[in-house]
Each structure stands twice: as C-alpha cells, then as structure tokens.
C-alpha cells in the first residue's frame, strides 16, 4: 500500500503537463492576498528640525489580490530535466478588504530625498542635489497616496535632475506588467527529490548580491518543496523579494481543513547578527549601520535595489536588536502577527496555507550638504510599510486533498 | 604628487568662444569634483562653476548659466571650460582647482577678449 | 546666495606683528569656510580649510576659528614672506562665493 502511494505521489508532483502538481504550479488556485500596513510619520517637524524619535502610527489593512496570473513562457528542458518560467506580476485592489482607498494619504519619508542622498556621497554632488531638494519644495518628509507609494509617482525633486534619471519612484514600482525571472527549477522527472528546486534564476546559480554562501540560490520559490517532508527538516527557500535565500523550520502540527500539515516559520536565528549566527556574517555589509555587525533584524538589500538603501526586516522589527528600532516610537511586534510560517502538508511537499510578511525600511542619513537632512544627529532605519502575503487552501481543493492524497493514506 | 596644467594663455575676438583644458595627475580623476574660478586683472576670484567627473553632476554659478559649459573626459582625465558669446569683461585668468575646498590650482590661463 | 563680506580690505603690519581678517556670511554656513594666500602672478594657495583644518605644510602661526556667519582669519608673528592677497571662501552652500579679499603690506 505505502509503495503504491508513494509511486503515486512521486508521478503527482512531478512538474510536467497532466500531473496535479503542474496544473497548480502553472496557476496557483489558491486565492493570494496581499495586506499593506502603511506607517504614517506623526512628527515629521520634529524629527527633520530636532533629531526626534520617530512617531509611526500603522494604517492598513490595505489589501491587494496579488500570484492570480499564470507562469509565463513556461519551457521544459528534457537533456537536464529542469522546467523554465518567468513569475508574472499583477495586484487587482481590494476595498471590500482595505480599510481605506487608494486615494488615502500618508506621511512618509521622501524617498527620494533618502535614496539620492545616500547614492551621491559626494560633497558637491549633495550640493547640487540640495538646490534643486529646495527648488522643487521637497523636503525629509513627503504627503502620498497610497498608489502613489507603491505602484509609483513621478518625483518634483528628481524631475530637475538635469541628467537621465529615473524620475518615476515607487516602492514596488514598477510591478503591474512586469515579470519576475526567468526561474530554472527541477521537474523531478529523473529525481523526485529535488522537485521544484531552483536550477538558475536570471541565468544563474548565484545572486552577485552577497559574498559567499549568501549569494547562494537555494531550495525552491516556497510554493512547494520536494515531497515526504520529515519535520527534522531544515527547508530552504529563496525569496527574490529579499534578494537572499532563507529557510524555515518545523514548529507544530496543525490542522488545516482536515489536512494534517507541518507548521514551518523562520526563526528568529535567521535573522541574527553574526555574533550569535556565525553563518549570517556575509549578510553584514558594511560596518556603520550595523554598528561593527553587532546589529540585527534588518538586511541591507541596496545592492540589489541599485544602490537605494533598502533594509528588509520583519515587521514592527520582530527579532531586530534594540538599537534598530530605538528611534522609531509606535512599533508593537508580536510573533503571532508579524513572522513568516508556511503550513506544508508532507506528503506532497505542497504549501496548502503561508503568512509572508516582511516590512520595507528605507536608511536616512544627516547630510552636511543637503539641508533637509543638516539637522539629523543620527541615522534612521525608517519603517515605510509592512505586509501580510496570505494564501489558504480553498474549500473544495482541501475536499479533493483530502479524498485523493490524506484519505488514502489514513 | 597632485599636479592640475593648464592650457596656454588665448587672446579672443569679442562674441567669440573660448575652450579651456585642464589635465589632471596624481590622483584618481573621477574621485574628485573640478571646479572653475575666474579673476579679472586686479580682481578678487570668483566662482563660476563646478563638475563632478565620477556623475556627470555640474553646478554653474547664475551669472554664467547659459554662457559656460563643463565637461570632463575621464579617459584622458581632462576637465574643460567653453566660455562663449565673449566679452571685454571676460578678460581674466582662469583657474582649474580641486575639490569643495579648491585644495590644488592649475598654473591659470589668461584669456584676453579684445576686438 | 550667501554673501561673504571680508574686512579689511587692505591693512599694513610689521614682522612679528598679529593680524586678523574677518569674514561675515549673510547665511549659517556651520563651519564650512576656507581661507587662501595668493602672491603676485601665482594661483591662490589653500592654508585652511573647513572645520578651522590646517593644511599640510602651511606654517602654525595660521590660523582660524569661527561658527555660523562669524569668522575670523588669524596670522600670529608676521613674517615679510606672509605679504600677500588673503581670500575666504564659504563652502556649505551653492554658488560657492569669495569674500572679496584683503591685500597685507609688510612695512
């Protein structure tokens, strides 16, 4: 009997046309939400005059539909049995799910009054960005739309830049009709255990992002993973939302709609500096900010974000150290709410319900030479916006689950 | 040792223009900005515009916008200065130099504009 | 625009004198003032720069301090060879401008 199914589980999720796996794997029949939570700035005076804390206070949910489209230009290549795709991007908004509209305003940090200031370290360059930060009324802080944030807006100060410069900014910009890849992963056809493993991505086995093994592409997308996942697993999965490769770990047994599935999260040591996680010392980039790799919780990701510097944490900062989040006032982190666990039903390796949540930071820095910014004492790691990346298992495919792969097996 | 050597002195024809070289050693061009100074016969200097080879970033003082042009060709790690629409007024030595705190000078090149 | 106005325009001293050059920006400029020698027929000579910062090679007995929009450009124990033109130069902000100087004369 155990034979029979394990051949048959081997055949199902195999990524090729006709099995189970590939008509999911193509078109993700469960329905992915995105929630945004934005971080208002209560204080945007103080803080660019005085060096105050920063005073967030989060608005959201603001919900998206987001993984509806199929895989594009989906090639398998039968000489080293790997199947191609490219990820399309596309996010419908939701109101019935948000607390607000699109239209909704925010306090933020000007992005790119942050971003520019950083990239041009350059005396002279920071002046010249200083007269035209003034000649276009930008300042430290800035009023948007929600859409505007996300999805883009054409920026006053960069407009002036006399030189090319991308003058649309966006915290996700651009992303409708865009496409992550192109994802090279193993259909399992010769070896079901490396099933939906990640070959190469944009052509390659490394990101040029990280030294060493940090720039290694490991594991799969985290949709699936190979099949008769044993809880002593360490599972890895790479996230190109992160720019790294990271990996989740057995918590509990849960019950998903009849289902028995493993409760895997990220644990707290993967975000730890280096001190504590050896491992994590090629995640440290440079000295400063992490105060000699002593800080935690955060990733600096500007290398892949063109130099903008972007810093990736969990939301509210959970499991970064006290001195990241020492400057911001109105954060509340809480395990519960705020880490990544992915539900993976063992037999097939198929993640049938996760929680994605990461929050997008931007580093502001005193500037002698840009005004906004002369009056700073300090460095900020701002908080511009967490999210909540969901998706449960519906209904009626957990019924043809459990009739087809649980209900076999019991 | 960092040197900055000029192009030699010009004598011009009023509406005309003037190109001015500056070539650089002794140090990484593109590491540091070129800025341009200029100081009529019995003057004090004054400002007229700064490039930074490493970005392309130029900033011109108000009173030449429109008439200077700065440009730096990293191959050859030489900043120019192009004057035009020159006048009596323009006659003054010009100096290359150095970074925010104009830490090393070219030698000058005397432009004279007479008709 | 900041407008840097220098004082005095000329002024005569004896060897081992003192003597001091004031420079008043119309803005706060922190502490982003450099002050330059030029001798007949030479380019200006960088002496010090931002922060009150004594370059390399240039004599002790230069020296300078100030904050915000007053400072002030001191010689101590004058020697013949210091006879010279004296330039600031306020470096915070664009356009970056020249006091209009000040001509030493060594009795």
């Known amino acids: 009997g155990d034979l029979l199914i394990q051949k048959t589980i081997k055949k199902q999720v195999v990524l090729e046309e006709g099995t189970i796996a590939f008509k999911n794997w193509v078109k993700t029949g469960t329905e992915v939400y995105r929630q945004f939570w934005i971080f208002d700035v209560q204080n945007p005076q103080e803080v660019m005059m005085n060096s105050s804390n920063i005073q967030v206070k989060q608005r959201g949910p603001y919900t998206y539909r987001v993984r509806f489209l199929a895989k594009e230009n989906v090639t398998q290549d039968a000489e080293d049995n790997t199947v191609s795709f490219l990820q399309p991007n596309g996010a419908i908004f939701e109101p019935s799910l948000s607390v607000g509209t699109e239209a909704d305003n925010f306090t933020v940090l000007n992005l790119a009054v942050a971003a520019a200031s950083h990239i041009y370290q350059n005396q002279f360059v920071q002046m010249i960005l200083n007269s035209l930060i003034n000649k276009s009324k930008s300042s430290m802080f800035q009023v948007r739309t929600l859409r505007e944030l996300l999805w883009g807006y054409r920026d006053p100060f960069l407009s002036l830049v006399p030189y090319p410069v991308t003058t649309t900014v966006g915290l996700f910009y651009p992303y409708n009709n865009t496409a992550d890849g192109v994802y090279k992963v193993f259909n399992g056809k010769d070896n079901i255990s490396k099933v939906a493993i990640i070959d190469t991505y944009k052509g390659k086995r490394n990101l040029s992002y990280w030294e060493s093994h940090c720039d290694m592409i490991n594991g799969t997308d985290a949709a699936s993973f190979p099949p008769f996942v044993e809880k002593s697993q360490v599972l890895q999965f790479f996230s190109s939302d992160i720019c790294r490769s990271i990996y989740a770990v057995f918590e509990s047994d849960v019950n998903l709609k009849g289902i028995p599935v493993y409760r895997f999260v990220l644990p707290s040591k993967a975000f730890a500096s280096p001190v504590e996680n050896p491992d994590n010392y090629c995640f440290c980039t440079e000295k400063i900010i992490s105060k000699n790799c002593t800080s935690y919780g955060v990733l600096d990701i500007s290398k892949c974000k063109e130099g903008r510097p972007v810093y990736i944490s969990l939301p509210h900062f959970l499991y970064a150290s006290p001195d990241v989040s020492e400057p911001i006032d109105g954060l509340n982190p809480n395990e519960e709410e705020h880490r990544t666990y992915l539900d993976i039903e063992p037999i097939t390796g198929f993640t049938l319900q996760f929680a994605k949540r990461l929050q997008v930071n931007l580093l502001v820095k005193p500037s002698e030479k840009i005004q906004v910014l002369k009056n700073l004492k300090r460095n900020y790691i701002v908080p511009i916006l967490w999210l909540n990346e969901t998706g449960t298992i519906g209904d009626e495919k957990a019924n043809m689950f459990r009739s087809q792969v649980t209900g076999k097996i019991n | 040792q960092v040197q900055l050597v000029q192009s030699g002195a010009e004598v011009k024809k009023p509406g005309s223009s003037v190109k001015v070289s500056c070539k650089a050693s002794?140090?990484?061009?593109?590491?540091?900005?070129m800025q341009w100074v200029r100081q009529a016969p019995g003057q004090g200097l004054e400002w007229m515009g700064g490039?930074?080879?490493?970005?392309?970033?130029?900033a011109y003082a108000q009173k030449f916008q429109g008439r200077v042009t700065l440009t730096a060709d990293k191959s050859t790690s030489t900043a120019y200065m192009e004057l035009s629409s020159l006048r009596s007024e323009d006659t003054a030595v010009y100096y290359c130099?150095?970074?925010?705190?104009?830490?090393?000078w070219g030698q000058g090149t005397l432009v004279t504009v007479s008709s | 625009e900041t407008t840097v106005t220098q004082s005095p325009a000329f002024m005569s001293a004896t060897p081992g004198d003192k003597v001091t050059i004031s420079c008043i920006t119309s803005t706060d400029i922190d502490d982003d003032m450099n002050w330059y020698q030029q001798k007949p027929g030479e380019p200006p000579k960088l002496l010090i720069s931002e922060g009150s910062t004594l370059r390399p090679g240039v004599p002790s007995r230069f020296s300078s301090s100030g904050y915000g929009t007053d400072f002030t450009f001191t010689i101590n124990n004058i020697e013949s060879e210091d006879a010279a033109y004296y330039y600031c130069?306020?470096?915070?902000?664009?356009?970056?401008?020249f006091g209009q100087g000040t001509k030493l004369e060594i009795k």
């Open positions: 130069l306020q470096s915070d902000n664009l356009p970056l401008t």
């Open positions: 490039i930074d080879p490493e970005t392309g970033g130029i």
């Open positions: 002794g140090y990484r061009f593109s590491d540091y900005e």
């Open positions: 130099t150095r970074k925010l705190d104009f830490d090393y």
